[in-house]
């Protein structure tokens, strides 16, 4: 058997570091027996077998220019071996983030915090902690480990799924290479990581007969849990065209009446989420969707809310369906003070 | 010879944005993350923002958080720190640093000063 | 984030004194903790990296101990120019922390 501990990577490779000395090993030869080493392709004798090193070649003070391809060989000149040596650096801690976009699964991204010039993978799992006693605050590792499934393709992502909302979890991401590990260990709690998707299938309608008011609708993202035991809340921004500053309300639910738009011009509307009970962060902002305030003259009657409010005679088509869920939405008033004011100004 | 060289500080309103670079030469750059450390007139040193070699992962301090942009080109072998709605309390030197392992700074530039103010 | 917390902020020694600066970390940091001198004027300079590595060209007088959240600095003979400030700092996790400083003057 060769007196070579095979490293991680290729095999025929031996790894040393930039500035360290080195030492590369034959691997054809019984440990202890005497060669001779070459440089591949040159004739010039490196370390003779009297050197009294046995099967190893000793690089003091390593340097790019000590990389590449070594010939070994025994004293009857047979081919001890052929060992190529690449330099590199031993793995630093890696950078580990984590996100959310439901309460029941998060994903660990990383990237290496220092390249090593060597090859190198990735370990990756997760511990569920604990807390210990009724009144510490102290945590323990209690549960696992347990592997944190890595995306395939190569792609630096692993997924937790089935976490547990109320729990905290150590994120293990250990970078490995020839000449060494290193572990970077992250706490983490789905309640601050939680970030939803943005909310999708916004639309902005006119409402007709009122020429200061936009109907805006949405549903829950894709990506929250079908029947959720924890309910969304959402933040919607508007503003007329060529306006800078967007104005924000917080709806109560899955629509909202604008009734301060500026007749006549479009307007921008986008949404964003986060859980009803503020754990994590609001979500990115949707895609803006547009729509401009009605200029049509106002009914002669004052139509009951659900007339104003008719269906467009075709759906406009949204990413996902919405998931059934309990209206947050209450019931929309009758006309108020707000909507007199408005039909006395557009009569005016 | 291994140098950071920052550039790009100097007198700005409050609310105003900025840009600072940081020239690295005498290293591989690229295989580094980059860091920006500040100190203020006469106080202590407060890290700033960090970036992987890649550029894919960045972390920031909470007082910059959203108003700062830290980024990197490595073909330019350039750090850059985009500021932006600068505050009286941003006024600091602001050190350009190359870490081993994330934090440990083996490698500092010698400062380029932002002042803000009306 | 992880608070420094550094003592004496500031010290007067003589020539030749063994000078001792303590750092605590407001968790456990392992041995991820470095000290740095500072100089007026002038950028830092890495003197200690892993609690007690001597960073590679610094003189022998200065040491460094500890792990979890007590560590010590440590200068055996202190000489002229090592007046400075000095700087304990974590790198645990990845928002690094400073220590508020420790000022070193001669007496």
């Known amino acids: 058997s060769s007196p070579c501990p095979q490293a991680w990577g290729p095999p025929g490779v031996q790894y040393g570091q930039p500035g360290r000395s080195v030492k590369l090993c034959c691997p054809g030869v019984t440990a202890g027996d005497p060669v001779s080493w070459f440089r591949d392709g040159e004739p010039k004798l490196l370390q003779g077998p009297d050197s009294g090193l046995g099967h190893e070649l000793v690089l003091a003070q390593a340097d790019s220019t000590d990389e590449g391809t070594y010939i070994c060989q025994t004293l009857d000149g047979a081919l001890g071996g052929t060992v190529t040596l690449q330099l590199g650096y031993p793995p630093a801690r890696p950078v580990v983030s984590c996100q959310a976009a439901d309460y029941e699964n998060f994903s660990c991204t990383w990237s290496p915090s220092q390249i090593s010039g060597l090859p190198t993978r990735y370990l990756t799992s997760y511990r569920k902690k604990t807390v210990l006693g009724a009144d510490s605050q102290r945590r323990s590792p209690s549960t696992g480990p347990w592997p944190c499934p890595q995306d395939p393709l190569g792609a630096a992502r692993c997924v937790v799924h089935g976490a547990e909302f109320w729990s905290q979890y150590r994120i293990n991401v250990t970078e490995v290479n020839p000449l060494g590990a290193s572990t970077r260990l992250l706490d983490v709690s789905l309640q601050s990581i939680l970030r939803p998707d943005p909310p999708q299938g916004l639309r902005v309608e006119s409402v007709p007969g009122y020429p200061r008011r936009l109907r805006a609708s949405w549903t829950y993202p894709a990506s929250w849990p079908c029947q959720p035991h924890f309910l969304l809340k959402f933040r919607l921004q508007y503003r007329p065209a060529q306006h800078p500053a967007w104005s924000t309300v917080e709806p109560a639910g899955l629509e909202e009446v604008i009734t301060d738009a500026v007749a006549g011009l479009p307007h921008a509307v986008r949404v964003s989420a986060r859980d009803f009970l503020d754990a994590g962060t609001w979500s990115t902002w949707s895609p803006e969707a547009w729509g401009t305030p009605s200029t049509g003259t106002i009914p002669k009657e004052i139509p009951a809310w659900g007339q104003l409010h008719t269906q467009p005679e075709v759906e406009p088509q949204v990413d996902s369906p919405a998931p059934p869920r309990p209206s947050l939405q209450p019931h929309p008033r009758l006309l108020d003070h707000r909507d007199s004011v408005e039909q006395v100004a557009v009569l005016a | 010879e291994v140098q950071l060289l920052e550039s790009g500080g100097g007198l700005v309103q409050p609310g105003g944005s900025l840009r600072l670079s940081c020239a690295a030469s005498g290293f591989t750059f690229s295989w580094y993350s980059m860091t920006w450390v500040r100190q203020a007139p006469g106080k202590g040193l407060e890290w700033v923002s960090s970036?992987?070699?890649?550029?894919?992962?960045?972390q920031y301090a909470d007082s910059v958080k959203g108003r700062f942009t830290i980024s990197r080109d490595n073909s330019k072998n350039t750090l850059y720190l985009q500021m932006n709605s600068l505050r009286a309390e941003d006024t600091a030197v602001y050190y350009c640093?190359?870490?081993?392992?994330?934090?440990?700074?083996?490698?500092w530039g010698r400062g380029t000063l932002v002042t803000v103010s009306s | 984030d992880i608070q420094m917390t550094q003592s004496p902020s500031s010290l007067s020694a003589s020539v030749g004194d063994r000078v001792t600066i303590t750092c605590q970390a407001s968790q456990d940091i392992n041995n991820y903790l470095n000290w740095y001198q500072q100089k007026p004027g002038k950028a830092p300079k890495l003197l200690i990296y892993d609690a007690s590595n001597l960073q590679t060209g610094v003189p022998s007088r200065f040491s460094g101990s500890g792990s979890g959240t007590d560590f010590t600095f440590t200068i055996s003979s202190l000489q002229p120019e090592d007046i400075a400030t000095y700087y304990c700092q974590q790198y645990d996790n990845l928002s690094p922390t400073f220590g508020p400083g420790t000022k070193v003057d001669i007496k």
């Open positions: 640093a190359k870490p081993e392992d994330w934090g440990r700074f083996d490698l």
């Open positions: 970036i992987v070699p890649s550029g894919g992962h960045t």
